[in-house]
């Protein structure tokens, strides 16, 4: 079961050959039952296969891995772990695998493993040192440098009593592990609030993507630390408005684009700053397309077109005279 | 109905060699992780090997590690067990298991077990 | 490896009384949201039986007399009115990693 030279093509190992198959290292040309391998492009696919647990015989070459569409359930210790290592290992997709629980040290021994998708997987326990590997307060820096976690949130009987935002953004700090990351897909993941340390301690974000979530105010975020920024993804959330603080780190970050489509902008008095810096600013990307959703009277007015007079704020009655 | 049905079980000296069999059926053999657990007499329970649905992934007790290999023909539906270097302390009898995943769950269908004994 | 060390060795109890046996793993087999125990019952002449899944989960078939708790380290089987038949050899058993490990086996008798 060579794999042939042509980069595109793969070839795939047969039962009979693979249940000969000693726990001995594995051979340099073979491929895991139930998977596809070109070591050509250095490649091995075990997609849609309802594979349990990770192969034990990966062969040595590969640089991109592709576990997608299984049902692996438990990311174990050293669940990549191999003698020898998988030293080029760069690329690993485990998106749609119906992964619940990812222990500490899952991806340890991993020396090159620069992208990790673990999208669409219910992570109802994703470990603290899932990424750091170690308790340590400082742990030896991770290679990663793209972290894909979309739609990883669980549903709502399987979570935990503590918050999921609190359980990822641990994963993400511990050890101070990731300083070296440069893209953070969160996207889709029922977000309410962005715990205020995340991006203080992810310093080399160049893309962020918290799309698709429900947060409803940055007031507590800081981007001030995040000088190579160049993308941030915060369309289909819950905002009401952007304040002054946040403007201001915003426009201070020199590359950077900020997508802020469908969320549910109040046009009152509190809007009137973010007008008027939406109308200066060149950060925003669709800018014009950004349109207010209340008050009722607001309803689908495009904020680049309101003027301070439009934003008006009910004034605050005295209980004497409020009505029940 | 699940059935495991172990064979290949027998007297046998130290040194030699023996191979069991595990022949299953009333399921679909090829989507079920498999273990052997053996049994000394008079003792308790002891996990052997243990191989993937697909064949790509096995384990053994390090007991076992290098004498042992487990393998299966899921075209057959059978599951094997090859016993090198045979030691007295092999003796027991072997079952072969079921596993609906390989951590989440027990084992949830076991063979009636054949039995191996080493002795000169 | 993981060593689960079971008690009591036997355990004699009158018909319809309670029978709880007790497992103790020497590190945790649980994480925060899943328990990796499992029990069985082994009668004389035959091969183990699945009672009990990750600590809790009653496999089909068996009475609902039977029960599992526990997480971390410490775990136990309730047998809530103990029968003729459930005269057997209990063990509990993790799949926390490899290698499985079971308890050396509880003995239910009737007292």
């Known amino acids: 079961s060579s794999p042939t030279s042509s980069a595109s093509s793969f070839s795939s190992s047969a039962p009979f050959l693979a249940s000969a198959v000693s726990a001995q290292p594995p051979l340099p040309d073979q491929c895991p039952a139930l998977c596809e391998c070109s070591e050509a492009a250095r490649t091995v696919k075990c997609v849609n296969r309802n594979l349990t647990e990770v192969p034990t015989d990966l062969p040595a070459y590969v640089r991109n891995l592709f576990l997608t569409g299984n049902q692996l359930a438990v990311l174990p210790a050293g669940a990549f772990a191999r003698r020898p290592p998988l030293a080029e290992l760069a690329a690993l997709n485990l998106s749609g695998s119906r992964l619940d629980e990812v222990r500490a040290g899952a991806f340890e021994h991993l020396p090159s493993l620069r992208q990790l998708d673990l999208s669409h997987n219910p992570l109802a326990d994703l470990s603290p040192f899932a990424f750091s590997g170690s308790n340590a307060s400082v742990s030896a820096p991770s290679p990663l440098v793209e972290l894909i976690l979309n739609h990883i949130v669980p549903p709502e009987d399987e979570r935990q009593n503590r918050s999921f935002e609190g359980m990822v953004v641990a994963a993400l700090l511990a050890g101070r592990a990731l300083q070296g990351l440069r893209r953070l897909e969160l996207a889709s993941n029922h977000f309410l609030y962005l715990p205020r340390d995340v991006l203080a301690q992810l310093p080399s974000l160049r893309h962020l993507d918290l799309s698709n979530n429900s947060l409803v105010s940055l007031t507590y975020v800081s981007f001030r630390n995040l000088t190579h920024l160049e993308s941030l993804h915060l369309e289909d959330n819950a905002l009401k408005v952007l304040h002054n603080g946040t403007l201001a780190e915003l426009q201070g970050l020199p590359h950077i684009r900020v997508f802020l489509d469908n969320n549910p902008w109040v046009c009152d008095c509190h809007m009137a700053d973010m007008v008027t810096w939406l109308k200066e600013t060149e950060v925003v990307q669709g800018k014009d397309r950004l349109t207010c959703a209340y008050p009722e009277k607001m309803r689908n007015r495009v904020l680049l077109e309101l003027n301070s007079a439009d934003l008006d704020c009910d004034p605050i009655l005295p209980p004497s005279l409020q009505t029940s | 109905e699940v059935q495991l049905v172990e064979s290949g079980g027998g007297v046998v000296q130290p040194g030699r060699s023996l191979r069991l069999s595990c022949a299953a059926s009333?399921?679909?053999?090829?989507?079920?992780?498999m273990h052997w657990v053996r049994q000394a007499p008079g003792k308790g329970l002891e996990w052997v090997a243990y191989?993937?649905?697909?064949?790509?992934?096995?384990y053994y007790a390090d007991s076992v590690k290098g004498r042992f290999t487990i393998s299966r023909d899921n075209s057959k539906n059978t599951l094997y067990l090859q016993m090198n270097s045979l030691r007295a302390e092999d003796t027991a009898v072997y079952y072969c298991?079921?596993?609906?995943?390989?951590?989440?769950?027990?084992?949830?269908?076991w063979g009636q077990g054949t039995t191996v004994t080493v002795s000169s | 490896d993981i060593v689960l060390t079971q008690s009591p060795d036997s355990l004699a109890v009158s018909l319809g009384e309670r029978a709880t046996i007790n497992c103790r793993a020497s590190?945790?087999?649980?994480?925060?949201?899943?328990?990796?125990m499992h029990w069985y019952q082994q009668k004389p002449g035959q091969p183990p039986k699945l009672l009990i899944k990750?600590?809790?989960n009653l496999e089909s078939g068996v009475p609902d007399r039977f029960s599992g708790s526990g997480s971390g380290t410490d775990f136990t089987l309730t047998i809530s009115s103990l029968q003729a038949e459930d005269v057997a050899v209990y063990y509990c058993?993790?799949?926390?990693?490899?290698?499985?490990?079971f308890g050396g086996g509880t003995k239910v008798e009737i007292k």
């Open positions: 298991a079921r596993s609906p995943a390989y951590y989440r769950y027990g084992l949830d269908y």
């Open positions: 009333g399921f679909t053999f090829s989507n079920f992780g």
């Open positions: 191989i993937s649905s697909g064949s790509s992934t096995f």
């Open positions: 590190q945790s087999v649980s994480s925060s949201t899943f328990s990796y």
């Open positions: 990750s600590s809790s």
């Open positions: 058993q993790h799949s926390w990693e490899i290698p499985y490990t």
